[in-house]
């Protein structure tokens, strides 16, 4: 039940924190214009990853998209692609994830493909989180940068822009939106990943003993059963047991390929 | 078609107060940033103050700052400019606009109201 | 405070000759972030209500004969009448539009020579 409940919220979890990088991603307040040396501008200026807009003080905004890719810096390209891997790595973890929620029955789906995906899910999950806070961090970087210098503009040069004019740019919504939303991925996939050890077949080694007829001895069968190599399906190694409580002993989990990740 | 028309004009002694309004129809008033602009007998076009669409950000020309204050009422579509402590100075015709175009530009204005400041 | 200086006060010009009126501000118009001048010009006629001509500096408002023209950027604009009409005797202001207070200049008094 705590499995289930661990997997379910690790999805939830990073279905959220997906949603939230794709919303940041999408997002033009990346950078503001900075009002402290100008708190009474009629004009604010705010840029996004894929254009800068202008909100009047009338309510009318115009928005220019970055309509050239060579002109732009290289740090916004780096952010551009780490967003988007982010995305689509968080995107095809959410696919396999839910196949692999325990809750849902597929066929005839054996709990170690289950355990195999929702680590797979996990681990595309954290990455995507991580992808998206490199990102959102190497902007704010950029931004800091920036803002101290003299330069006029962000993306100086870009769209040959004139640089007559001192507007300073501080960090946006989306930055924010864009780091909680990558913390949330990390923790959903971690989530899955610590679901994922619950969800494996326990692989333990019991002696297995044999019970004969009086009159003959009684065998002791060593060795118990073999780790298995893969998650797909392995009724051989598997031991069944006709009753008779266990122990406390009997219960414990043994290392598996879970463990290490 | 879009309309301005300002009321609450007249004659008041210098320390004298006045309330001004702006009945505003012809389009969504409470999308719209509005001003007063003021103009003295035989001078130049003075801007007064400017009220954002939702009243979040109100802005003064330094010569009214502290005696004047504007306000806003959407659902009536009326614009308010409470004027206190008036002055000679203050004489003027005034007129309501709307940043209704691009680039802050104030494309609508009223036909304006007379406030004389006099002994 | 921008402060807008007009020049000159007033213009005296023969019908169908160029009117020029200059606008110079204490401080750049001009935003970077959408390339664009925030300088209006008004024309206000005889006994009547200011009347917008040309916004973004260069812009004109829709149906503004295209006679009038707005130029320059930063801190110098330039209203340009090229051939003056009758109806056109009126008085130009310009507007800082860019940072409140939203200052007008002084304004220059256009009439017929």
């Known amino acids: 039940m705590a499995v289930t409940a661990c997997q379910g919220l690790g999805f939830v979890v990073s279905l959220i924190g997906i949603a939230g990088i794709i919303a940041a991603t999408c997002m033009d307040q990346w950078s503001t214009q900075d009002l402290y040396n100008n708190p009474v501008t009629a004009v604010f200026n705010y840029q996004g990853l894929w254009r800068s807009c202008v909100r009047e003080s009338s309510g009318f905004t115009e928005c220019r998209g970055y309509f050239t890719l060579l002109g732009l810096p290289a740090m916004l390209q780096a952010v551009r692609a780490l967003m988007i891997v982010g995305i689509v790595l968080g995107a095809i973890g959410l696919l396999v994830s839910i196949f692999a929620l325990k809750c849902i029955r597929i066929g005839s789906m054996e709990d170690s493909a289950k355990a195999n995906m929702t680590l797979t899910s996990g681990i595309m999950f954290i990455v995507s989180g991580l992808c998206a806070i490199a990102g959102v961090s190497v902007f704010a970087n950029m931004l800091v940068t920036n803002f101290w210098m003299s330069t006029a503009n962000m993306y100086t040069g870009m769209g040959g822009m004139v640089q007559t004019v001192q507007t300073r740019y501080t960090f946006g919504a989306a930055l924010f939106v864009g780091w909680v939303a990558g913390g949330l991925t990390l923790i959903g996939g971690v989530m899955m990943c610590i679901a994922c050890r619950g969800l494996a077949p326990e692989e333990t080694n019991y002696k297995a003993v044999s019970y004969h007829a009086s009159g003959h001895s009684v065998a002791y069968k060593p060795g118990g059963f073999k780790a298995s190599t893969g998650f797909g399906s392995n009724t051989k190694n598997k031991k069944i047991y006709d009753g008779g409580a266990r122990t406390e002993d009997e219960v414990q989990s043994y290392p598996s390929k879970h463990d290490y990740v | 078609d879009v309309q301005l028309v300002e009321s609450g004009g007249g004659l008041v002694q210098p320390g004298g107060s006045l309330r001004l309004s702006c009945a505003a129809s012809g389009f969504t008033f409470s999308s719209f940033g509005m001003h007063w602009v003021r103009q003295a007998p035989g001078k130049g076009l003075e801007w007064v103050a400017y009220?954002?669409?939702?009243?979040?950000?109100?802005y003064y020309a330094d010569t009214v700052k502290g005696r004047f204050t504007l306000s806003r009422d959407n659902p009536k579509n009326t614009l308010y400019l409470q004027m206190n402590s008036l002055r000679a100075e203050d004489t003027a015709v005034y007129y309501c606009?709307?940043?209704?175009?691009?680039?802050?530009?104030?494309?609508?204005w009223g036909q304006g109201t007379t406030v004389t400041v006099s002994s | 405070d921008v402060v807008l200086t007009q020049s000159p006060d007033s213009l005296a010009v023969s019908l169908g000759e160029r009117a020029t009126i200059s606008c110079k501000s204490s401080?750049?118009?001009?935003?970077?972030?959408?390339?664009?001048?925030?300088l209006t010009w008004y024309q206000q006629k005889p006994g009547q209500t200011p009347t917008l001509l040309i916004y973004w500096a260069s812009t004109r408002k829709s149906g503004v004969p295209d006679r009038f023209s707005g130029s320059g950027s930063g801190t110098d604009f330039t209203l340009t009448i090229s051939s003056l009409q009758a109806e056109d005797v009126a008085v130009y202001y310009c507007?800082?539009?860019?940072?409140?207070?939203?200052?007008f200049g002084g304004g220059t008094k256009v009439e017929i020579k």
């Open positions: 009220i954002s669409s939702g009243s979040g950000s109100i």
């Open positions: 507007q800082n539009v860019y940072s409140y207070p939203l200052t």
């Open positions: 401080q750049s118009l001009f935003n970077v972030g959408n390339q664009k001048n925030y």
């Open positions: 606009a709307t940043s209704y175009y691009y680039g802050n530009a104030l494309e609508y």
